[in-house]
Amino acid sequence: MKVLQEPTCVSDYMSISTCEWKMNGPTNCSTELRLLYQLVFLLSEAHTCIPENNGGAGCVCHLLMDDVVSADNYTLDLWAGQQLLWKGSFKPSEHVKPRAPGNLTVHTNVSDTLLLTWSNPYPPDNYLYNHLTYAVNIWSENDPADFRIYNVTYLEPSLRIAASTLKSGISYRARVRAWAQCYNTTWSEWSPSTKWHNSYREPFEQH
């Protein structure tokens, strides 16, 4: 039994890191393998992650971690019984994929303005709380070409757009994702989408 693709890990910079790897053949990850991990820290202890299958030869492990700080470094040992298959390390702050924003809501009762709000996925004491920026994706269910992205580069988790920038009388969906420039993170997953019916009063045309 050998590792074909070494484990690569990403952290949510809060409490979970996800490591994925591939074996050289079909493997029952949960019965044959264990991933041991330990924070390099005077008061830390070793933990064991039981991997799950991720395709025939692929394995994935969800590592429960202490609250992350930038200096953290974890040792990783992949075992098959008594055989050490791979040894490595992982700095969560260097491989961050933020959590997805939640609670996306479209407020349509503000005159002819659409107000989209969502929740920051981090608590205020987390470093990423004040460092996230967002991308909002709005698309029409009726017209696949009607697809737009709004970049929200300020900290407030909200977006205002004129309802008239979208077509009236049809349904739209929106979703939002996050990233943090300070740690050069990847984008988060998209939030669940929310749907609304866009309607606004067309201004009378002047002839």
Epitope: S15, F41, L42, L43, S44, E45, D66, D67, S70, P124
Partner: antibody, heavy 115, light 109 residues
Amino acid sequence: EVQLVQSGGGLVHPGGSLRLSCAGSGFTFSRNAMFWVRQAPGKGLEWVSGIGTGGATSYADSVKGRFTISRDNAKNSLYLQMNSLRAEDMAVYYCARGRYYFPWWGQGTLVTVSS
Amino acid sequence: EIVLTQSPGTLSLSPGERATLSCRASQSVSSSYLAWYQQKPGQAPRLLIFGASSRAPGIPDRFSGSGSGTDFTLTISRLEPEDFAVYYCQQYDHSAGWTFGQGTKVEIK
């Protein structure tokens, strides 16, 4: 908002015992190492003890064998049991949350050791 | 045990002046584990700098940290009235644990 609220300080005779408490809120207590740091009157800061999320502990040589740090994650609380107290243990004791450094501190509680 | 020695013991300066505080370690310290704190009378310490040079959230940019190995510096570019306090450096070591310097008092001249 992160808060660390301390209690349990007071006057104790040399050789006596005292238990300090620190209640945490506004963060996930169980995922954080916790510490005690003290400051004798007019002196500098001295690290006393720390406890990891899994219960691993460490002590300064000056308190080893006399002080015991513990935590109750269900109550979001940190404790310091101080036995065989000496005059040189008299200080303001702070609880702190952190790891390699201490971003969050309690308000401090005064322990007076005097006959 | 790693010993941190701060100098000077007391720094007498006027508001608007630049303050340079030194922290010297008895053996090499990882920059990732070097921090600076400010403490005012009757208050708990406040983290200013971590990782030798990163400002903690909410700390004004007049505070900066630098250094590596055994020599570290905290600089306050222009002293404000609220900056007069005692400053401590602190290090963490995987075997020796946590130690503080003895402090530098920045007082009004």
